[in-house]
């Protein structure tokens, strides 16, 4: 650590007294301190002398050496007072800039340590300090006001009282700059815009930030817009806002609009498109298929997707048939709004019964006229199966009749014994019927088809069953001949109706 | 040893702010002073105005209307703006340790900054 | 303010010969404050001499500085090719810190 000369703390001298500061190292040293005049610099080696024939208040400061080849930076100070009784302050600044919530040194610095008792800090004019403002004092360094807040961004002057009469130094501008967090707060309105050839149109572009030191711009496909700027200041934020009001829209002015900020700490820009129409439009569509199968029993949901502009005038679900004149409940239609111009409207039915197949339109209305989208709604049924025992043209049949969607597959089984169904031990023969004859096929209904099996003799102690499935599930009838006639058995689990 | 790095937009339009920052690596901001002098194309030096490293700050007069400067010692770096620009404010500006006793020792390499529309 | 007047405003020399700039102040610089600076096309200045006399750190003893009150002189020994630059002095003892508007040394 370099060694000063003399080795004071602190040395009070009178204005014109030569003053001779001298500091040695272990290798070459620098001086440091308060910009001031008449100080002569001599550096021989390992040591560096400040010297003045001539201090002045001025001079007053701490003079600072150190060892710039020291790895561990260490450093001697020495502050000298030059006592000038006309000059109680020397003043190092005419401007200080900190931080809300920083301490904010104003460096009068006292050039008479015996004046410290009387000294103050007072705004220019002799206006006392704000209220709340926490400050002390130090001979060497000045006033310091604690957590400086921007309301405290005034011009102060030190005080001294000297022979009972206060002595105010030149004056110090504090400025307490605003922590600005990040680039300005944005916001441009509308976020999209859909207008018609003709009609008038606004987009807003604004920020906002601590700090007044911001810029704002809006620019048009990468053309920056003039428009005049409107400021103002609440909640403490500057806010600056540009307002393009357009009276008559034209396809030039459609395109992507970009609002801009930039302060010092980066930039912050947002974008929204504009569309400019010929006409109205509306325009429906849905993600899901418009031809729609469901287990009966199950829910449903039909979603539609509305583009529109102008808005919607009126829109409503509506149930076209064939079973009923119901309609679809109102609180079973839902509307959310995506954006602006686009909504989605959803029909929940819940738990479908048989009379609700069907079409199902979804209407729409603006001044563009009438869109419908119209879903068509089958029901999915397991197969139900009946056999029955007849003659054809003189040959013994049986007949088994299987209804249900899809369309039912339709297998024969023989087995031994008498059984509710056949299990795989007792079949004796399996046929498959590939093109069971189609008795009713109608949209949005149950598809009946009939399958006829020719029987020359019927053995009394066997068991004659019909199968049906399909997609949903199957269905099946058993018959067993007795001798006094023919005996049917439903399976025991009937099938579920709903 | 102490090395400085100036860095903002180098396009700025009339009537803006300019901001330029000054980042001190290799030593501490703490216990020294910091100057910005900038230089016109072809033209000589202009000390704009310095700062201490505790925002206490000396303004060249001819500038001194316009010209803020800050200080954060947390980063190690300080700034200048300078408002309401003109294309005579088209210049290299450099930042540089100013000491009382042996001028401006150490200095950032500068940055170009134009001012037009 | 303290205005610096620099002469020659151009100096053509070769390398190998003395080069003499002069930087004249428009009232009395503490021979303590008055610096010069090198400054080479695309680069920043560099610190040769501060306090009139003292050459900064690294800077070859080619380089020279005297003067007092108003008058003040570089010198360079003998010109090397990397020394042909522009040269600025500066006071730096009265605010606002001035510059000189350079002496261009050119080979010749």
């Known amino acids: 650590i370099p060694v000063i000369e003399p080795s004071v703390p602190e040395l009070v001298v009178k204005p014109g007294a030569t003053v001779t500061l001298r500091c040695v190292g272990n290798g070459s040293v620098e001086w440091d301190g308060p910009p001031s005049p008449h100080w002569t610099l001599y550096s021989d080696g390992s040591s560096s002398i400040l010297s003045t024939n001539n201090a002045t208040f001025q001079n007053t400061g701490t003079y600072r050496c150190t060892e710039p080849g020291d790895p561990l930076g260490g450093s001697a100070a020495i502050h000298l007072y030059v006592k000038d009784p006309a000059r109680p302050w020397n003043v190092l600044a005419q401007e200080v800039v900190v931080f809300e919530d920083q301490d904010a040194l104003l460096p009068c610095l006292l050039t008479d340590p015996v004046l410290e008792a009387g000294v103050s800090l007072v705004r220019v004019r002799g206006r006392p300090l704000m209220r709340h403002t926490n400050y002390s004092f130090s001979p060497w360094h000045g006033f310091t006001i604690h957590r400086a807040k921007f309301i405290q961004s005034q011009d102060y002057q030190c005080s001294a009282l000297m022979g009972g009469r206060k002595v105010m130094s030149i004056s110090i501008r504090l400025k307490v700059q605003k922590v600005i967090p990040g680039p300005p707060a944005l916001t441009l309105v509308p976020a999209e815009l859909v207008r018609i050839r003709g009609e008038a149109a606004q987009i807003v572009c604004s920020a906002s930030s601590v700090d007044v030191n911001f810029d704002v711009f809006l620019q048009h496909n990468n053309t920056k817009l003039a428009i005049p700027q409107q400021s103002d200041f609440h909640n403490n934020r500057y806010q600056k806002v540009l307002t393009l009001n357009l009276d008559q829209v034209d396809f030039q002015h459609a395109g992507n609009y970009s609002c801009v900020a930039s302060n010092v700490q980066g930039k912050h820009s947002t974008s929204m498109f504009f569309r400019v129409v010929e006409s109205a439009y509306l325009n429906l569509s849905s993600e899901q298929n418009l031809i729609q199968e469901v287990t009966v029993g199950e829910g449903l949901n039909l979603k539609v997707m509305v583009e529109a502009y102008p808005g919607l005038q009126g829109f409503n679900w509506t149930y076209l048939g064939p079973f009923s004149d119901h309609q679809p409940e109102p609180k079973l239609a839902n509307a959310t709004t995506k954006d602006t111009y686009r909504h989605t409207f959803t029909l929940s039915l819940p738990r479908l019964k048989p009379s609700e197949a069907g079409r199902y339109s979804f209407l729409a209305r603006n001044p563009g006229g009438w869109r419908a989208l119209t879903f068509e709604l089958t029901l999915r049924y397991p197969p139900e199966v009946s056999v029955i025992w007849t003659f054809i043209n003189g040959s013994g049949t049986l007949l088994c009749a299987a209804s249900g969607y899809p369309q039912p597959n339709v297998t024969w089984l023989q087995c031994s014994g008498h059984t509710d169904r056949c299990d795989e031990a007792q079949v004796l023969q399996v046929w498959d019927d590939p093109y069971p004859e189609v008795l009713s096929q109608e949209p949005f209904h149950k598809v009946t088809v009939q399958s006829l099996l020719t029987v020359e003799t019927l053995e009394h102690n066997q068991t004659y069953e019909c199968r049906a499935h399909n997609s949903v599930g199957s269905g099946s009838w058993a018959f067993i001949p007795i001798s006094a006639g023919a005996h049917t058995h439903p399976p025991d689990e009937f099938l579920f109706t709903p | 040893q102490v090395q400085l790095q100036e860095s903002g937009p180098g396009l700025v339009k009339p009537s803006e702010t300019l901001s330029l920052t000054c980042t001190v690596s290799?030593?501490?901001?703490?216990?020294?002073?910091w100057s910005w002098i900038r230089q016109p194309a072809g033209k000589g030096l202009e000390w704009i105005g310095r700062?201490?490293?505790?925002?206490?700050?000396n303004y060249n007069p001819s500038l001194k209307s316009r010209v803020t400067m800050s200080v954060d010692t947390s980063k190690n770096q300080f700034s200048l703006k300078l408002s309401s620009v003109t294309a005579a404010d088209t210049a290299v500006f450099y930042c540089?340790?100013?000491?009382?006793?042996?001028?401006?020792?150490?200095w950032g390499q500068g940055t170009t900054v134009t001012v037009s529309s | 303010e303290i205005v610096l007047t620099q002469s020659p405003g151009t100096l053509s020399l070769s390398p190998g010969e003395r080069a003499t700039l002069s930087c004249r102040a428009s009232?009395?610089?503490?021979?303590?404050?008055l610096a010069w600076y090198q400054q080479k096309p695309g680069q920043a200045p560099r610190l040769l001499i501060y306090?009139?006399?003292s050459r900064a750190t690294g800077i070859p003893d080619r380089f020279s500085g005297s003067g007092s009150g108003t008058d003040f002189t570089l010198t360079i020994s003998r010109l090397e090719p990397e020394d042909f630059a522009v040269y600025y002095c500066?006071?730096?003892?009265?605010?606002?810190?001035?510059f000189g508007g350079g002496t261009k040394v050119e080979i010749k």
């Open positions: 540089a340790r100013d000491r009382a006793f042996y001028g401006m020792d150490v």
């Open positions: 290799g030593g501490s901001i703490s216990s020294y002073y």
């Open positions: 500066q006071q730096y003892g009265n605010s606002p810190l001035t």
């Open positions: 700062i201490y490293s505790s925002g206490s700050i």
């Open positions: 009232q009395s610089v503490s021979s303590s404050y």
């Open positions: 306090g009139a006399s």
